[in-house]
């Protein structure tokens, strides 16, 4: 939860804000609820839809070192173990990522296994 100083009324200065909850589906426009003492507030917010990507904020992994280069594929791989997931994110326990062996080629890592729904 985020804590913010908001000058609203004389009694409340520190509001505690809950998560942004989309009004429909999993992302897009929604509301965030704040509390301060007995007071509550709802404000508009937006959950970006790009969090569905394998390496979004939903699933955080701790990675091993890169393995040796596989000559047959020209790639090297490493494994990641789940470190933290957003509460409702159905993240894989482990993922494997690959990248080209040559350090000259700048390429985004690709997940062979990522977040998946049951």
């Amino acid at each position: 939860k985020k804590k913010e100083k908001v000058k609203k009324g004389s009694e409340c200065s520190e509001w505690t804000w809950g998560p942004c909850t989309p009004s429909s589906k999993d992302c897009g426009m929604g509301f965030r609820e704040g509390t301060c003492g007995a007071q509550t507030q709802r404000v508009h917010c937006k959950v970006p839809c790009n969090w569905k990507k394998e390496f979004g904020a939903d699933c955080k992994y701790k990675f091993e070192s890169w393995g040796a280069c596989d000559g047959s594929t020209g790639t090297k791989a490493r494994q990641g173990t789940l470190k933290k997931a957003r509460y409702n994110a159905q993240c894989q326990e482990t993922i494997r990522v690959t990248k080209p062996c040559t350090s000259k080629t700048k390429s985004k890592t690709k997940a062979k296994k990522g977040k998946g729904k049951d």
Epitope: K1, G18, T81, L82
Partner: antibody
Amino acid sequence: QVQLVQSGGGLVQPGGSLRLSCAASGQSFSSYWMNWVRQAPGQGLEWIGMIHPSDSETILNQKFKDKATLTVDISKNTAYLQMNSLRAEDTAVYYCSSWSAKRGDFWGQGTLVTVSS
Amino acid sequence: EIVLTQSPATLSLSPGERANLSCRASESISNNLHWYQQKPHQAPRLLIKYASQSISGIPARFSGSGPGTDFNLTISSVEPEDFAVYYCQQSNSWPLTFGGGTKLEIK
């Protein structure tokens, strides 16, 4: 599979404090949210809050903001619930549960806290 | 906070009958609704997660529907060991909240 073993419950005087423990074994303790839930005798379930062992991020039910403190000790694979200023209405069975959206959850056996003079 | 209202409070059935338990949320919670079974002196046991997702080890006679505000837990053919209290829980926003429970009892 995760096994959760709880301890620390018992009889406490009104106004007193108690620290409940939830020791995890099995799969990685540090990867999953740890919830604390209580159940008063003959009543329903009430969520106290949760903590993530990887970084101690804590989300607390506002009802318990002056009553409960959640902590973890990664080295011991243990989560703790500290309850302060206890009153008769805090008498309940307290449960911890480890939550993964992917595989579901695992619960401790529960520990009874009785607040009485 | 999101209020979950379960109905009926008590459901009396005979083994072999179909059970329909309802959980209504005070606002839309997408599919972030879970069902638990609790027997006396035991911890709750997760039956269904995210409205309709099955849980390993839970018999196939348990199924759930959603999403939105109206959710149902169905037991296709009640077995003697199913008589217990059933709770719904939402994880759409904090605080997490539970319904008041439905007691499934033997008729």
